[in-house]
């Protein structure tokens, strides 16, 4: 029987900049039953306080609600397991919730071909962005990117739209079933998972860009 | 209308106890961070205790220590403080506070009028 | 315990002029921390300036917030009737305290 080994915060991520959740991952329990504390100061603060929600994020987890999240405030957190035998602590880690934001992916993705008379045929997306993002505010800035592949094929065309939430594509093999799908990004942060897979049929009948 | 209202005040003599009651309306109580603040006459601000939204760890200023005891109860909107063992030197105009955000230590932005303790013999 | 120290104590002023206030702490203090107060006679105390300076919902302009370290400052611009009051700057970077108080009264 020995005291825990030492825990690690291993990722820090927040859907909207309003809330965020830290997980850790235990070390060695020692043979005995651990218990698990986050305790966290914001900089420049000489207070410690513990995590106010350890339950919304699942297992190890610290939730950190509308009430604890501050912008432009950096946390610093460490995690305490503690058995019988004694206690150990992980790093101090330091969390800017600006960079830790992973948004939920885009929204509503239709996809159409168009065939104007005058102009050749071309496919044209559509999304919006997703709800927990207020745009609106100008706290964020959201960039999108876009992969399809026809359906029995292994590798993926991406593009990149920037700030727009439609696009077209011109080059698409006619006669085939495209996979398309889009996903978002904060100017600063991670990409969001990639939405589901909306399926267009090209016609036979479509032409070729040059 | 976003307010606090204090209760429980009144005169006691030293050794004894009160307890002071505090509710809120017009906001989401469980958002804040609340504390007591108290101004004796004459004087100037001081922090007695308070805690975080969720009612976590509590806090108190070192003259209260082991006589006061700060409560709250989300569900009813209501922020409590149990004084035992008064004293000449508590005497004075109780604030019930509110922090701007879910700490406790925070600017406090919203006060409510005060109920007066008094502790005399 | 971070001790706040206010100055001047009072402060003599004419309406219509500029107030300079200072709070000078007993250690730095990191500047998210610090708030101001306004506490007209009779009244419960109000919250001017966060964060060294930002200013509270429904501050007018006139009052603005600076300062780092050790030494803040809270100015007035044009003093209106109901300025003259007791200012008390306040840390909650640690357990909270008060200053003592700037008195602003009419010359």
């Known amino acids: 029987q020995l005291p825990p080994g030492k825990p690690e915060i291993f990722k820090c991520r927040s859907p909207n900049k309003e809330t965020f959740t830290c997980w850790w991952r235990p070390g060695t329990d020692g043979g005995l039953p651990t218990n698990y504390s986050l305790t966290y100061h914001r900089e420049g603060e000489t207070l410690m306080h513990e995590c106010p929600d350890y339950i919304t994020g699942g297992p190890n987890s610290c939730h950190f609600g509308k009430q604890y999240t501050s912008m432009w405030r950096t946390y610093v957190m460490m995690v305490n397991a503690t058995n019988q035998m004694g206690s150990s602590f992980s790093d101090e880690l330091y969390v800017d919730v600006t960079y830790i934001v992973q948004p939920d992916p885009p929204l509503e993705l239709t996809v159409e071909v168009k065939q104007p008379e005058d102009r050749k045929p071309y496919l044209w997306m559509k999304w919006s962005p997703p709800t927990l993002i207020d745009l609106k505010t100008g706290w964020f800035t959201l960039l999108y990117e876009i992969r399809l592949k026809p359906e029995k094929a292994a590798e993926w065309e991406t593009h990149f739209a920037g700030q727009q939430t439609e696009f077209k594509i011109l080059s698409l093999h006619p006669g085939q079933k495209y996979l398309v799908q889009v996903r978002c990004k904060p100017d600063h942060g991670y990409w969001s998972a990639w939405s589901p897979a909306t399926f267009i049929q090209i016609p036979s009948d479509f032409i070729m860009n040059d | 209308e976003v307010q606090l209202v204090e209760s429980g005040g009144g005169v006691v003599r030293p050794g004894g106890s009160l307890r002071l009651s505090c509710v809120g309306s017009?906001?989401?109580?469980?958002?804040?961070?609340m504390n007591w603040v108290r101004q004796g006459p004459g004087k100037g601000l001081e922090w007695v205790s308070g805690?975080?939204?969720?009612?976590?760890?509590?806090n108190y200023a070192e003259s209260v220590k082991g006589r006061f005891t700060i409560s709250r109860d989300n569900a009813r909107n209501s922020l409590f403080l149990q004084m035992n063992s008064l004293r000449a030197e508590d005497t004075a105009l109780y604030y019930c506070?509110?922090?701007?955000?879910?700490?406790?230590?925070?600017?406090?932005?919203?006060w409510g009028p005060g109920t007066m303790v008094t502790v005399s013999s | 315990e971070i001790v706040l120290t206010q100055s001047p104590g009072t402060l003599s002023l004419s309406p219509g002029e500029r107030a300079t206030l200072s709070c000078r702490a007993s250690?730095?203090?990191?500047?998210?921390?610090l708030a101001w107060y306004r506490q007209k006679p009779g009244q419960t105390p109000r919250l001017l300036i966060y964060?060294?300076?930002s200013r509270a919902t429904g501050i007018p302009d006139r009052f603005s917030g600076s300062g780092s370290g050790t030494d803040f400052s809270l100015t007035i611009s044009r003093l209106e009737p109901e300025d003259f009051a007791v200012f008390y700057c306040?840390?909650?970077?640690?357990?909270?305290?008060f200053g003592p108080g700037t008195k602003v009264d009419i010359k």
């Open positions: 306040q840390q909650y970077a640690g357990l909270p305290t």
């Open positions: 250690q730095t203090i990191n500047s998210n921390y």
């Open positions: 017009g906001f989401s109580f469980d958002d804040h961070g």
């Open positions: 964060g060294t300076s």
């Open positions: 506070v509110r922090g701007r955000s879910g700490w406790f230590n925070d600017a406090f932005d919203v």
């Open positions: 805690f975080n939204w969720n009612g976590g760890s509590t």
